[in-house]
Interface confidence: medium
């Protein structure tokens, strides 16, 4: 069971300082942006991180949403990352959900975060380069200290 607590507005960056945004095709991508670019591209660069209490505490349970033309929430259904047109729900009556991730700080690096899927244990949000695009994907942690699954989260409230 997950029960919604509060929400924060955040900018999410990978460890190369690229900013996560949602493109016109609703794809989550990373791109080099100055602070000014980041502001100019709002609301596509500002994410609503909603925190949930977890009946089985396993880290901070969160959803990641964006408010563009509609509210869309990040999902890892079938291990494929996409934004689904839906609100972060008030309650989820299950111990796993495609939209719930466990946000945890990287041991020894309090400012670096990882997001583990609640549906797929051991799978994390990651940044992966595909041709010219830097994409947000779901990836199994295969090595300790994998930088691709580490992010910084800057509160904008």
């Amino acid at each position: 069971y997950f029960g919604k607590l509060e929400s924060k507005l955040s900018v999410i960056r990978n460890l190369n300082d690229q900013v996560l945004f949602i493109d016109q095709g609703n794809r989550p991508l990373f791109e080099d942006m100055t602070d000014s670019d980041c502001r100019d591209n709002a609301p596509r660069t500002i994410f609503i991180i909603s925190m949930y209490k977890d009946s089985q505490p396993r880290g901070m349970a969160v959803t990641i949403s964006v408010k563009c033309e509609k509210i869309s929430t990040l999902s890892c259904e079938n291990k494929i990352i996409s934004f689904k047109e839906m609100n972060p729900p008030d309650n989820i009556k299950d111990t796993k959900s495609d939209i719930i991730f466990f946000q945890r700080s990287v041991p020894g690096h309090d400012n670096k975060m990882q997001f583990e899927s609640s549906s797929y244990e051991g799978y994390f949000l990651a940044c992966e380069k595909e041709r010219d695009l830097f994409k947000l994907i779901l990836k199994k942690e295969d090595e300790l200290g994998d930088r691709s699954i580490m992010f910084t989260v800057q509160n904008e409230d």
């Epitope: 919604k4 100019d40 609503i48 509210i71 839906m86």
Partner: antibody
């Protein structure tokens, strides 16, 4: 049809705490889908959002007032309340309570669709 | 905070006129904008939300348009009851902020 009725003292002394209550009829503050908000308007000036409370108890405050504001809900009485501490003459305004449709996929979100009639609160010794 | 700037501050018009009020946001807010009408001594009343969606019960002479940073409220044919002050409000992210208001008065 939801209606909001405001109550509370209209005169508050400087440095004291302003307290107002909004009673909701025709709907429940404990059902999801809405925030319950406070907005103020100094005489002859524009509107300023103070803060909102969700049925779950989550609160959202204007950063410019956050250190002085508390919004709370009383589900059995179907009321929500505003407390603003350490008031000065600059806090003299008409205070409104309002209902706010929450984040919603169909986009009815984060505006103020039902308002109380407003209470003029004067801060003066 | 997102700053909302309305123009003009005051607008003089006559019954039957078509009038337009503009609102500019300090950053892109997509379509997350609402318009309100306020008469003296009364609470504001929402007219339009999501930039162009007419609130239930609001006359069709009111319309809204725009996206990003620039928005307009249009009254196609002014009626005597439309003389009031109009406010825009961004509904993208808190803190929710309002424009300073446009007073629509009789010419």
């Amino acid at each position: 049809q939801v209606q909001l009725q405001q109550s509370g003292p209209r005169l508050v002394k400087p440095s004291q705490t302003l307290s107002l209550t909004c009673t909701v009829s025709g709907g429940s503050i404990s059902s999801g889908g809405y925030y319950w908000s406070w907005i103020r308007q100094p005489a002859g000036k524009g509107l300023e959002w103070i803060g909102s409370i969700y049925y779950s108890g989550s609160t959202y405050y204007n950063p410019s007032l956050k250190s002085r504001v508390t919004i709370s809900g009383d589900t059995p009485k179907n009321q929500f309340s505003l407390k603003l501490s350490s008031v000065t003459a600059a806090d003299t305004a008409v205070y409104y309570c309002a209902r706010t449709p929450a984040y919603d996929g169909d986009a009815r979100a984060d505006f103020f669709d039902v308002w109380g009639r407003g209470t003029l609160v004067t801060v003066s010794s | 905070d997102i700053v909302m700037t309305q123009s003009p501050s005051t607008l003089s018009a006559s019954v039957g006129d078509r009038v337009t009020i503009t609102c500019r946001a300090s950053q892109g807010i997509s379509s997350w904008l609402a318009w309100y009408q306020q008469k003296p001594g009364r609470a504001p009343k929402v007219l339009i939300y999501k930039a162009s969606t007419l609130e239930s019960g609001v006359p069709s002479r009111f319309s809204g348009s725009g996206s990003g940073t620039d928005f307009t409220l249009t009254i196609s044919s002014l009626q005597p009851e439309d003389f009031a002050t109009y406010y825009c409000q961004q509904s993208l992210y808190p803190p929710w902020t309002f424009g300073q208001g446009t007073k629509l008065e009789i010419k």
